[in-house]
């Protein structure tokens, strides 16, 4: 995520006694929460690395920039950065790698420019369907974000909830219509085995969309039709074996897209014949050359753009005498 | 069935190019990954990078970039790598592979002494 | 760059005896694993690819597993032409990279 940076001697440190002093009250204009370092002029907090179990709650309300990541602190609560007066200028927050296990309904509220928010490496087992868009109304009033970046947020397999993964993320991600205009959703390293099939069709905003390293076989019931703005899909290093023609032209018919193939088992059989032709054809699959046949084991390495039909083909099927168990 | 057969050995001076080759038969050579690898005593084995013959792309690990350079020669279905301004950290045995998710089949590979 | 560390660099053995060779990634690789062996000659063969698939040709003496950033390839039943070195070799992510090699020999 883009945010300015600026050189250690701009950021000032605040005294320890200072938080536990003043936190009941209205933050001081150019007050700096103990553990963190604040720099009016690049309008940035930083408490890094710092073991926070709660979000600090003097905040300066100059903050533009919050960088809150390497913390410990489990659960967000509902309207854990609401502030009298409130972080209007709030617009770039980053939760990463704090141990966050649980997100509340209404964790963001009061947040009126929040356009980056970023909660990767979080183990999530418990995001909440309202986390995003504050209210359980089935039309919630518009988010702000832009940039939603939910990376490696899948928790161990002993940790999550007795239900899908993948639903509760796409839950919190259409909760009320809020994130309409999100441009960039990356959900990058999260085991997910499928793409739940509404979920792109009410994100018609986006421009970048990043499913890469997940476990992802097929895309025969996703749609790409709505989203006439997307300009990147990452699915390298997912469990991908063909592309059937659905899919294929949907993605061409995308008027800005470039897509990210590589690290799948592409499997070389009769049913890649289709891919194939439009590879050879398409301008819009990023290093397509170095798309290579995982199996069958006769087809290994093989580079997808060299095949033609008469190597793409399937054992034929015997009739059940014939078929040994 | 498939073979690579590589250049003989080279005995070059520091500062010299060296251009090895690798002759590939028994398969479409068009239609795989050449890699080349480097293997220097107590070094074990780098990648260089790679070319597909056919198209003449080519990927090259970083650390090989400028050293090596990679051209394919498809009417005779032979893979090159030229190595320029050889010092003696370039003496190895370099081998070509057929690849690119495996490297099923190894030439024999060439020695590249560099001296004085 | 994924480091692949092989953290026994020789080991002895007694013709029958199963080996066990051991190959860590500093990242998690998804099973893009290989193994190769070299023969004293410099002849290089792949063994396994993906972890545990046996590459054609291969004796089912030879075997992977592994997964995320440990890997292992054994031998069930050592057989004097398994003297050599191996290595695994990494294919998650550009530059593929090698582990440093275990050097087999009898006892």
């Known amino acids: 995520s883009s945010s300015p940076t600026s050189s250690a001697s701009s950021f000032s440190s605040s005294a320890p006694f200072l938080a536990s002093a003043v936190s009941a009250q209205p933050p001081l204009p150019d007050q700096c929460p103990a553990l963190c370092e604040c720099s009016e002029a690049a309008r940035t907090v930083k408490c890094v690395n710092r073991n926070l179990t709660e979000v600090p709650t003097d905040l300066p309300a100059y903050v533009r920039n919050l960088f809150l990541t390497g913390n410990q602190l489990a659960v967000l609560p509902a309207g854990a950065f609401a502030r009298r007066p409130p972080l209007a200028e709030l617009a770039a927050l980053n939760l990463s790698g704090s141990r966050l296990d649980e997100v509340r309904a209404g964790a963001f509220e009061h947040l009126p420019s929040l356009r980056q928010l970023d909660l990767s490496h979080n183990p999530l087992a418990d995001l909440s369907p309202f986390a995003f868009s504050g209210s359980n109304a089935s039309v919630s009033a518009p988010s702000p974000l832009v940039e939603l970046i939910l990376n490696h947020i899948v928790p161990p397999e002993d940790e999550r909830q007795n239900r899908s993964f993948e639903g509760m993320v796409v839950a919190a991600l259409l909760a009320g219509r809020a994130l309409q205009g999100l441009r960039r959703l990356e959900l990058a390293s999260n085991h997910f085995l499928y793409l739940p099939r509404d979920v792109l069709a009410q994100l018609p905003s986006l421009r970048h969309l990043d499913l890469s390293n997940n476990s992802l076989v097929s895309l025969t019931y996703v749609s790409f039709r709505n989203l006439t703005h997307l300009e990147s899909l990452h699915l390298e290093d997912n469990a991908l074996k063909v592309l059937h023609n659905g899919t294929l032209a949907e993605l061409q018919g995308l008027p800005h897209i470039r897509v990210f193939l590589d690290n799948n088992p592409w499997v070389c059989d009769c049913h890649m014949a289709d891919m194939v032709t439009w590879l050879k054809e398409t301008e819009v699959v990023q290093g397509k050359d170095r798309l290579t046949c995982a199996y069958p084991e006769k087809m290994r390495n093989r580079v997808l753009l060299e095949l033609n039909s008469a190597d793409l083909d399937c054992d034929p099927i015997l009739p059940p005498s014939l078929q040994t168990s | 069935q498939v073979q690579l057969q590589q250049s003989g050995a080279e005995l070059m001076k520091p500062g010299a190019s060296v251009k090895l080759s690798c002759k590939a038969t028994?398969?479409?050579?068009?239609?795989?990954?050449i890699e080349w690898i480097k293997q220097r005593p107590g070094h074990g084995l780098e990648w260089i990078g790679e070319?597909?013959?056919?198209?003449?792309?080519?990927d090259y690990n970083e650390k090989f970039k400028g050293k090596a350079t990679f051209t394919a020669d498809t009417s005779s279905n032979t893979a090159y790598m030229q190595l320029s301004s050889l010092t003696t950290e370039d003496s190895a045995i370099y081998y070509c592979?057929?690849?690119?998710?495996?490297?099923?089949?190894w030439g024999q590979g060439t020695l590249v002494t560099v001296s004085a | 760059d994924i480091q692949m560390t092989q953290t026994t660099s020789s080991l002895s053995a007694s013709l029958g005896d199963r080996v066990t060779i051991s190959c860590s990634a500093s990242?998690?690789?998804?099973?893009?694993l290989n193994w190769y062996q070299q023969k004293p000659d410099g002849t290089v063969k792949l063994l396994i690819y993906?972890?545990?698939s046996l590459h054609s040709g291969v004796p089912s003496r030879f075997s992977g597993s592994g997964s995320g950033t440990d890997y292992s390839l054994t031998i069930s039943n050592l057989e004097p032409e398994d003297i050599a070195t191996y290595y695994c070799?990494?294919?998650?992510?550009?530059?593929?990279?090698f582990g440093g090699g275990t050097k087999l020999e009898i006892k």
């Open positions: 070799q990494q294919y998650s992510k550009v530059p593929w990279t």
């Open positions: 993906y972890t545990s």
């Open positions: 028994g398969y479409t050579f068009t239609g795989y990954w």
């Open positions: 990242q998690g690789i998804r099973n893009y």
């Open positions: 070319i597909l013959p056919g198209r003449g792309s080519t």
């Open positions: 592979t057929r690849g690119r998710l495996d490297f099923t089949y």
